[in-house]
Amino acid sequence: CKAMHVAQPAVVLASSRGIASFVCEYASPGKATEVRVTVLRQADSQVTEVCAATYMMGNELTFLDDSICTGTSSGNQVNLTIQGLRAMDTGLYICKVELMYPPPYYLGIGNGTQIYVIDPEPCPDSDF
């Protein structure tokens, strides 16, 4: 048994369309068949769930239809994309990985990715 390490980038800049992508990688200490990945947002000392998905190893990771997240998985790496971000959503986004099955359960928590979101300037009216 070893503690599970989760790695994620320190900083990501969202695109002008409010889309941010980052990789969440975990060092699996066991042979998990069922993995749950959760994106948490930490503001001050408050932690809220942004989105979560459970997937079977070797299968694709599926978020709920109304989720603002999409993602793909490859081995012990998950590529996460968060959409619809605005400047007020700038903050620390933590990747949480849980090895759900088979036992034992493992919890791994990343240090967080600071996502910066800049709202695009509205286009000025052009007189042509």
Epitope: C1, A3, V47, P104
Partner: antibody, heavy 118, light 108 residues
Framework: QVQLVESGGGVVQPGRSLRLSCAAS????????MHWVRQAPGKGLEWVAV????????HYADSVKGRATISRDNSKNTLYLQMNSLRAEDTAVYYC???????????WGQGTLVTVSS | EIVLTQSPGTLSLSPGERATLSCRAS???????LAWYQQKPGQAPRLLIY???SRATGIPDRFSGSGSGTDFTLTISRLEPEDFAVYYC?????????FGPGTKVDIK
């Protein structure tokens, strides 16, 4: 505000069964792992079991494996612990506790006392 | 399973003194997954520290946590009368989730 209220404790004879309940309110129940932790009189804390999110995954302490079943009803915001083949060493205060999103146990119920005695 | 050992078993101190409580794990624990709880007689445990060093909401800053790997410490900088209680460390990174046996801080 978050509230956890346990019920179902009491005096029960060895070999019999008991079902404990924990009514939760003030948070999104299905987003949290929910645990039972027990404490024998004058002793320390012992983790008993957890049920995760939709209830499909559960884990147990060796001391209760095969005798305990943890379950949850997300539509009723209620956590359960069914204990069978009770032994004297199961005598304890049973606490229901919430796993915070980062994993630690942030809210605890007041506890319900189970006494196994003939 | 990860076994947590706490020392000392009992700490006898006076109000205003500094308390240093130790928690040692039988194998490496992620510092993200180590918590400290306080329990007073007849009450449920109360979360003090999570992630080895983060104070829970409403916990006074005289409580601090530190450590990594297998060695963790809870420090109470100046004991107040209400701090005399039993303190438990816990790891929540690998099931079964385990608690230390506790350290009782009592009045000298």
């Amino acid at each position: 505000q978050v509230q956890l209220v346990e019920s179902g404790g009491g005096v029960v004879q060895p070999g019999r069964s008991l079902r404990l309940s924990c009514a939760a309110s003030g948070f999104t129940f299905s987003s949290h792992g929910m645990h039972w932790v027990r404490q024998a009189p004058g002793k320390g804390l012992e983790w008993v079991a957890v049920t995760w999110y939709d209830g499909s995954n559960k884990h147990y302490a060796d001391s209760v494996k095969g005798r305990a079943t943890i379950s949850r009803d997300n539509s009723k915001n209620t956590l359960y612990l069914q204990m069978n083949s009770l032994r004297a060493e199961d005598t304890a205060v049973y606490y229901c506790t919430r796993g915070e999103l980062l994993g630690y146990f942030d809210y605890w119920g007041q506890g319900t006392l189970v006494t196994v005695s003939s | 399973e990860i076994v947590l050992t706490q020392s000392p078993g009992t700490l006898s101190l006076s109000p205003g003194e500094r308390a240093t409580l130790s928690c040692r794990a039988s194998q490496s624990v992620s510092s993200s997954c180590l918590a400290w709880y306080q329990q007073k007689p007849g009450q449920a445990p109360r979360l003090l520290i999570y992630g080895a060093s983060s104070r829970a909401t409403g916990i006074p800053d005289r409580f601090s946590g530190s450590g990594s790997g297998t060695d963790f410490t809870l420090t109470i900088s100046r004991l107040e009368p209400e701090d005399f209680a039993v303190y438990y460390c816990q790891q929540y990174g690998i099931s079964p989730f385990t608690f230390g046996p506790g350290t009782k801080v009592d009045i000298k």
